[in-house]
C-alpha cells in the first residue's frame, strides 16, 4: 500500500533552523512533490516548495533549500527568523504525485516540547489521498 511519511527536525545547534523530511513508500515513480505548511496543499495550506525530478525545484520563503535525498524522499530546510518561533506549532504537509498511484499526502509537526534534534511523528491521522 502506498504511504507517505513525514518528519520535522529541529537543528540541535541552530534552534531557528528546521528541516522537513518526507518520502513516498510504494511502487511507481515520483512525478512531483509539493511541501506546504498550515495544512494540506489546496486545503488551506501555503506552498513552501515544489520538487520535480527533472525540471528542478522551486521554493518560497521561509524555505531555504529543497533537495532530493533519494529518488523517493526529499528534505526542505527552513529558516525561522521570527522570535516567536512559529514553526513550533505548525503542521507541514508533503504531497507526492506518483504514476500510476495518483497523489498521496501526509502531515507532521514538531512536538511543542521538542528537544533539539528531535523529529516529529506524523499527525495521528495522515491525509492519504489517492486522486
Amino acid at each position: 500500500t502506498p504511504e507517505v511519511w513525514v518528519q520535522v527536525q529541529m537543528e540541535a545547534t541552530e534552534l531557528s533552523s528546521f528541516t522537513v523530511h518526507c518520502g513516498f513508500l510504494g511502487p511507481g515513480s515520483i512525478s512531483l512533490v509539493t511541501v506546504s505548511w498550515g495544512g494540506p496543499d489546496g486545503a488551506g495550506g501555503t506552498k513552501l516548495a515544489v520538487l520535480h525530478p527533472e525540471l528542478g525545484t522551486r521554493q518560497w520563503a521561509p524555505a531555504r533549500q529543497a533537495r532530493w535525498e533519494t529518488q523517493s524522499s526529499i528534505s526542505l530546510a527552513l529558516e525561522d527568523s521570527g522570535a516567536s518561533s512559529p514553526f513550533a506549532n505548525t503542521t507541514f504537509c508533503c504531497k507526492f504525485a506518483s504514476f500510476p498511484e495518483g497523489s498521496w499526502e501526509s502531515c507532521g509537526s514538531l512536538p511543542p516540547s521538542s528537544d533539539p534534534g528531535l523529529s516529529a511523528p506524523p499527525t495521528p491521522v495522515p491525509i492519504l489521498r489517492a486522486d
Epitope: R67, T70, Q71, S75
Partner: antibody, heavy 118, light 107 residues
Framework: QVQLKQSGPGLVQPSQNLSITCTVS????????INWVRQSPGKGLEWLGV???????EYNAAFRSRLSISKDTSKSQVFLKMNSLQADDTAIYSC????????????WGPGTSVTVSS | DLQMTQTTSSLSASLGDRVTISCRTS??????LNWYQQKPDGPLKLLIY???RLHSGVPSRFSGSGSGTDYSLTISNLEQEDIATYFC?????????FGGGTKLEIK
C-alpha cells in the same frame, strides 16, 4: 545487480587519517543516499554519516569534527575521510545504500577492516 | 542519542518454531524502525523497514510490528538459514542508532 565495493587501508597509525572509497554499480548515486557505518566488538554498530543524492550530508555529532563524506557521481564513488584515528576507532567500516530516506540501508558493502595500531 | 535496547542477547529455538525478537527504544520513534540480519563475517541484510514493510526478496515468514517504544520482529516458521544475529535500528532522529543485537541459535 546492485553492488558496493570498498577499498582502503587495513592498518592505520595512531593520529593518522583514514580514507575509504565506496564504488557502486547497478544503480546511480543520483537516486540514492550512501551511509557509512562502523562495527566493533566493543561499541557495536555506529552510524557515522550519510551523503544524499542531492549532495547534502548529515553526520553523527560524535564524529562531525573529524569526518568528511563526499562523492564523485560521474565515477559512482563515495569517499569517507576520518582524521586523527585512535585505537578505539578500530572497526569494520561499511558503506550502505539508502533508497527510502528512512536510514534503512538495503544494500551493504563488504566492509573494510581497519586496525589502528603502531 | 536515542537508546535502542534488545534485552535478549541470545535466543534458542527449534526449527519450525515461531520466534519473536524484541526491541525497545528510549522514546517514541513513531514507527521509524528497521530490522537487519547478520551472519558471521557477513554484511548486514535489511529485512524490515518502517516497522512492518518487508524489503524486496525477504521471505514472507519475516514480519515486523510495534509502535511507540516497543517493536518486534517475528519469524513464523524458523528455518536453518535464519540462524543469525538480528539488529534493530531507528531512523527517527539523528544519529540513527542500533540495538546490541539478538543472536538466534538452534535448540
Amino acid at each position: 545487480q546492485v553492488q558496493l565495493k570498498q577499498s582502503g587501508p587495513g592498518l592505520v597509525q595512531p593520529s593518522q587519517n583514514l580514507s575509504i572509497t565506496c564504488t557502486v554499480s547497478g544503480f546511480s548515486l543520483t537516486g540514492y543516499g550512501i551511509n557509512w557505518v562502523r562495527q566493533s566488538p566493543g561499541k557495536g554498530l555506529e552510524w557515522l554519516g550519510v551523503i544524499w543524492s542531492g549532495g547534502n550530508t548529515e553526520y553523527n555529532a560524535a564524529f562531525r569534527s573529524r569526518l568528511s563524506i563526499s562523492k564523485d557521481t560521474s565515477k559512482s564513488q563515495v569517499f569517507l575521510k576520518m582524521n586523527s584515528l585512535q585505537a578505539d576507532d578500530t572497526a569494520i567500516y561499511s558503506c550502505a545504500r539508502d533508497s527510502t530516506g528512512l536510514y534503512a540501508m538495503d544494500y551493504w558493502g563488504p566492509g573494510t577492516s581497519v586496525t589502528v595500531s603502531s | 542519542d536515542l537508546q535502542m535496547t534488545q534485552t535478549t542477547s541470545s535466543l534458542s529455538a527449534s526449527l519450525g518454531d515461531r520466534v519473536t525478537i524484541s526491541c525497545r527504544t528510549s522514546q517514541d520513534i513513531s514507527n521509524f524502525l528497521n530490522w537487519y540480519q547478520q551472519k558471521p563475517d557477513g554484511p548486514l541484510k535489511l529485512l524490515i523497514y518502517y516497522t512492518s514493510r518487508l524489503h524486496s526478496g525477504v521471505p514472507s515468514r519475516f514480519s515486523g510490528s510495534g509502535s511507540g517504544t516497543d517493536y518486534s520482529l517475528t519469524i513464523s516458521n524458523l528455518e536453518q538459514e535464519d540462524i543469525a544475529t538480528y539488529f534493530c535500528q531507528q531512523g527517527y532522529m539523528l544519529p540513527p542508532t542500533f540495538g546490541g543485537g539478538t543472536k538466534l541459535e538452534i535448540k
